[in-house]
């Protein structure tokens, strides 16, 4: 059972009049513009900035008063500012959505340290993992390392978006006062949706006597 609660002063259940609501989309997948209405009799128009209107055809684009506009396989045409409009009692209401295309491509993953890493016991280990992706891509970066169960490492993350062609994600792993138990394989794993890449390096610990 779906119940409409009619409100003449608020035709849309969620109103984003000033700041658009961000909707993440993937080309070829279903995209819902969730401008559901407070009454099934409200006529809604879906506009694409700057000068177009999407026409529901009952196939690729469907209007459902309980959900909004359902686009069965989104294309590049739906990227940008989309506005749902409804006129109630002579008053025009608008709710705005900004579609953001997400890609899942990981171009490259590197650990910017010589391999294998040779370190004196008691010194600090710093490993910098760098993931390069196209714009509009987000990634999750995780580390696995020998003494992970004791949470020996601290990890800092940052994004460099100054490049006009790519995003560069950094994950910096730091372990203070390295001990023998910290030696072994260090792996940086990068995931974006279904895409996955990893890179690893071996860390060797030496006493001063053996240098």
């Amino acid at each position: 059972i779906y119940i409409f609660i009619s409100d003449t002063g608020r035709p849309f259940v969620e109103m984003y009049s000033e700041i658009p609501e961000i909707i993440h989309m993937t080309e070829g997948r279903e995209l819902v513009i969730p401008c559901r209405v407070t009454s099934p009799n409200i006529t809604v128009t879906l506009k694409k900035f700057p000068l177009d209107t999407l026409i529901p055809d009952g196939k690729r684009i469907i209007w459902d008063s309980r959900k909004g506009f359902i686009i069965s396989n989104a294309t590049y045409k739906e990227i940008g500012l989309l506005t749902c409009e409804a006129t109630v009692n002579g008053h025009l209401y608008k709710t705005n959505y900004l579609t953001h295309r997400q890609t899942n491509t990981i171009i490259d993953v590197q650990i910017s340290t010589p391999r294998p890493v040779k370190l004196l016991r008691g010194h600090t280990l710093v490993l910098n993992c760098t993931a390069t992706t196209p714009l509009n891509t987000r990634v999750q970066m995780t580390w696995s390392y020998p003494d992970e169960k004791n949470k020996r490492a601290s990890v800092r993350r940052r994004i460099d978006q100054s490049n006009s062609h790519a995003n560069i994600f950094y994950s910096v792993l730091t372990i203070d006062k390295m001990q023998n138990k910290d030696k072994g394989l260090y792996t940086c794993r990068v995931r974006s949706g279904p895409s996955f890449k990893s890179v690893n390096t071996s860390v060797h610990i030496y006493d001063k006597a053996f240098i």
Epitope: N41, T43, T45, D52, L54, G58, W63, S65, K77
Partner: antibody, heavy 121, light 106 residues
Amino acid sequence: EVQLVESGGDLVKPGGSLKLSCAASGFTFSDSGMSWVRQTPDKRLEWVATISSGGGYTYYSDSVEGRFTISRDNANNTLFLQMSSLKSEDTAMFYCARLGNYGGYYGMDYWGQGTSVTVSS
Amino acid sequence: DIQMTQSPSSLSASLGGKVTITCKTSQDSNKYIAWYQHKPGKGPRLLIHYTSTLQPGIPSRFSGSGSGRDYSFSISNLEPEDIATYYCLQYDNLWTFGGGTKLEIK
């Protein structure tokens, strides 16, 4: 007053091409989706093609897909239908119609008087 | 695509009388049904949209009803200017017209 005036209809041989035009006035053309609908000699109405207000979205019936192209010139308030590889079964009166939003979906609300297309050798 | 079966294909009625035309769709059209009047030499004229809503300026002698797959259109108190062919249209899934009903006055 909404006015739609079609032109360009003619007698054409099978396999030939023809371009229809529809001059619009009395409303904000650039805000309106538009369609072409034809009436066959047996008086049946058949939807042919539709274009969104900005021209970014086009829709075609299976019978004309790949042969006909709908387009528009918003600066000059004109709708077009480029027809190629014409067949005898394309013989019809072609109407242009404005779309109106009725409950979230679009129906044709205003129509022109039509232009006649005959495909015959 | 949705198919539309309109009946009857023609009918004759007396002035002042009432006629009813029906349209059956091959699948639920969610009330997205319109009715048109078409006279020779002119373009079709929209009378009713969304099953039962009269267009501005259309007399209340015209009416529509229905839901799901079954829809009907009626003209009461028939007048001479009602002589025309009437068409239904479903606009829920692309656009499909009924075959038309030619109305004559006895």
